[in-house]
Interface confidence: low
């Protein structure tokens, strides 16, 4: 570590005196910073010497010496005071620039350490500091304004009490710059716009920045628009607003509008699309199939997307039948607005009952007229089966009726013994009816089919079973011939 002679850390001299500062190290040494012309600098072996024959108040400052070859990078310093009764201050810089919330050093150095007790900081021409100005003083460095604020960017003077009167330094201008975190904040409203040809429209592009130095413009497709700019300042931010007002829109006004703002940190842009239409429109669509099938007892949401301009004047869900005159519970209908011109309407149908199958229509109206979208809801049912013994054209016949949706298919089984249901081990014969007769097939209702098994004689210790199944489930009915006629068994519940 280098050593300075005299040993310091402070040296007080009078104006006109000769001052010699010698720095000695193990290797070569050098003095930091720019050395004013009043000093003579020469090397003497491993030492470097600063000398002046005529010290002035302007030589007041800290002198630091370093040894470049020292791996520890040590340095030594001495602070020189040139005690001038007429010049209590040596101002090193007339302008200081800092960012907001940084400490601002106003480098007015006291030329006489004895004066430290009577120093103060004032604004130009002795005006007091702004309230909440938090500062401290160091005789070696000057005044420090802590966490400087933008509003504290002012002209300051350092004041010292000499012989009962205040002596001011020359002024120091402090510039406090706002910290610009990024490009200006932008808003472009509306985010999307639709107008009918001939209507009025307004697009507002606004940008805000913490500093006044920024630009904003509105662009239509690739054309930069010449629009008067309104400026404002609120919430500690500078605002610039461009308002495009169109009294009567036409198709050439349609297209992409971009709001672009820039500052020293860069550029920020946001866009919106303006659509001009010939007349009012109202479009209904669904991502779902309009023909829906759901198993009885389950739930379903019917969803309709609406695009409309002008806005909707009314909308509702209606049940069109055929089973009852009930109408959808309003609590089951839900509306969400995706954006200004797009909406989603949902009808929730929980635990569907047989009487709730049928047509559901969503109707909406705007000045363009009415539109409707109709869903057809069919319920799926597992088959229900019954078997009766009858005589057809003198022949004994087993008649199986199966009812369900989708249409059930029918299989007959003959098995040994008397049983409520044939299991695989007992099965003697299987007949599949490829084309059972359809007895009824009404929209939104179960399909009822009938299958006949003609038998001249039914063997008494055997069971005949009719089985029906569809995509939802299956059902069966067992028939056991007995001497007194016949008896049947429905399946176990």
């Amino acid at each position: 570590i280098p050593v300075i002679e005299p040993s310091g850390p402070e040296l007080v001299v009078k104006p006109g005196e000769t001052v010699t500062l010698r720095c000695v190290g193990n290797g070569s040494v050098e003095w930091d910073g720019p050395i004013s012309p009043h000093w003579t600098l020469y090397s003497d072996g491993p030492s470097s010497v600063l000398t002046t024959n005529n010290a002035t108040f302007q030589n007041t400052r800290t002198y630091r010496c370093t040894e470049p070859g020292d791996p520890l990078g040590g340095s030594a310093a001495i602070h020189l005071y040139v005690k001038d009764p007429a010049r209590p201050w040596n101002v090193l810089a007339k302008e200081v620039v800092v960012f907001e919330d940084q400490d601002a050093l106003l480098p007015c150095l006291l030329t006489d350490p004895v004066l430290e007790a009577g120093v103060s900081l004032v604004r130009l021409r002795g005006r007091p500091l702004l309230r909440h100005t938090n500062y401290s003083f160091s005789p070696w460095h000057g005044f420090i304004i802590h966490r400087a604020k933008f509003i504290q960017g002012q002209d300051y003077q350092c004041s010292a009490l000499m012989g009962g009167r205040k002596v001011m330094s020359i002024s120091i201008r402090l510039k406090v710059q706002k910290v610009i975190p990024g490009p200006p904040a932008l808003t472009l409203v509306p985010a999307e716009l639709v107008r009918i040809r001939g209507e009025a429209a307004q697009i507002v592009c606004s940008a805000s920045n913490i500093d006044v130095d920024f630009d904003v413009f509105l662009q239509h497709n690739t054309t930069k628009l010449a629009i008067p700019q309104r400026s404002d300042f609120h919430d500690n931010r500078y605002q610039k607003v461009l308002t495009l007002s169109l009294g009567q829109v036409d198709f050439q006004h349609a297209g992409n509008y971009s709001c672009v703002a820039s500052n020293v940190q860069g550029k920020h842009s946001t866009s919106m699309f303006f659509q001009v239409v010939e007349s009012a429109y109202l479009d209904l669509s669904s991502e779902q199939n309009l023909i829906q099938e759901v198993t009885v007892g389950e739930g379903l949401n019917l969803k309709v997307m609406v695009e409309a301009y002008p806005g909707l004047q009314g909308f509702n869900w209606t049940y069109l039948g055929p089973f009852s005159d009930h109408q959808p519970e309003p609590k089951l209908a839900n509306a969400t607005t995706k954006d200004t011109y797009r909406h989603t309407f949902t009808l929730s149908l929980p635990r569907l009952k047989p009487s709730e199958a049928g047509r559901y229509s969503f109707l909406a109206r705007n000045p363009g007229g009415w539109r409707a979208l109709t869903f057809e809801l069919t319920l799926r049912y597992p088959p229900e089966v019954s078997v009766i013994w009858t005589s057809i054209n003198g022949s004994g016949t087993l008649l199986c009726a199966a009812s369900g949706y989708p249409q059930p298919n029918v299989t007959w089984l003959q098995c040994a013994g008397h049983t409520d249901r044939c299991d695989e081990a007992q099965v003697l014969q299987v007949w599949v009816d490829p084309h059972p007769e359809v007895l009824s097939q009404e929209p939104f209702q179960k399909v009822t089919v009938q299958s006949l098994l003609t038998a001249e004689t039914l063997e008494h210790n055997q069971t005949y079973e009719c089985r029906a199944h569809n995509s939802v489930g299956s059902g069966s009915w067992a028939f056991i011939p007995i001497s007194a006629g016949a008896r049947t068994h429905p399946p176990d519940e």
Partner: antibody, heavy 119, light 111 residues
């Protein structure tokens, strides 16, 4: 071009009703409201109401509710205004006028129908 | 109900001079930057004719000597210069709120 052709003058007795017509041509009939406006001799203009031909919906000035009934026949592109229980106060010229969406001005007018209520 | 008060009730203007007609609304109205105030001209025995729509827009085919201005509650129709054909009654009308209402009219005569 857009035209609104109104029916001819009417001379009616107090207490009777009168049905005026306004036939539209030259534009998509169902897209625009048809308004009716009353003007008494030497007086100003008074809005009666509008009918929306697409679905027959109406909007009336409260003052004329029950007095006027607005209907539309889209097949003949004709709008009707029936005025009931006529008194001498109903003697006036009645105009039909086309407007577009809410806020649009009455850009096209019929020539007017003079109704005279007299015993 | 918005009441529109026109002034003056009548005025006489020399040819090639300026005519100014005022229309004051009983309450301020403005909708999305649109001012639904319109001006009509009516000559004896004829239906009204649209001159200005939305306060300041000139209807197609109307001479440029007609102009409209104003916002909120105070609106003005200006004819400059007046021509012989402009002798008529002028009405303001608001389409902002039901019931739609007209001003009482201003009769323009030529000196």
């Amino acid at each position: 071009q857009v035209q609104l052709q109104q029916s001819g003058p009417e001379l009616v007795k107090p207490g009777a009703s009168v049905k005026l017509s306004c036939k539209a041509s030259g534009y998509t009939f169902t897209t625009y409201d048809i308004n009716w406006v009353k003007q008494r001799p030497g007086q100003g203009l008074e809005w009666i109401g509008w009918v929306y031909p697409r679905d027959g919906s109406t909007k009336y000035n409260e003052k004329f509710k029950g007095k006027a009934t607005l209907t539309v026949d889209t097949s003949s592109r004709t709008v009707y205004m029936e005025f009931h229980s006529l008194t001498s106060e109903d003697s006036a010229v009645y105009f039909c006028a086309r407007s577009g969406l809410t806020g649009s001005p009455f850009a096209y007018w019929g020539q007017g129908t003079l109704v005279t209520v007299s015993a | 109900k918005i009441v529109l008060t026109q002034s003056p009730a009548s005025l006489a203007v020399s040819l090639r001079q300026r005519a100014t007609i005022s229309c004051r609304a009983s309450e301020s109205f403005d909708s999305y930057g649109n001012t639904f105030m319109h001006w009509f001209q009516q000559k004896s025995g004829q239906p009204p004719k649209l001159l200005i729509y939305r306060a300041s827009n000139l209807e197609s085919g109307v001479p440029a000597r007609f102009s409209g201005s104003g916002s909120r509650t105070d609106f003005t129709l200006t004819i400059d210069p007046v021509e012989a054909d402009d002798a008529a009654t002028y009405y303001c009308q608001q389409n902002n709120e039901y019931p739609l209402t007209f001003g009482s009219g201003t009769k323009l005569e030529l000196k």
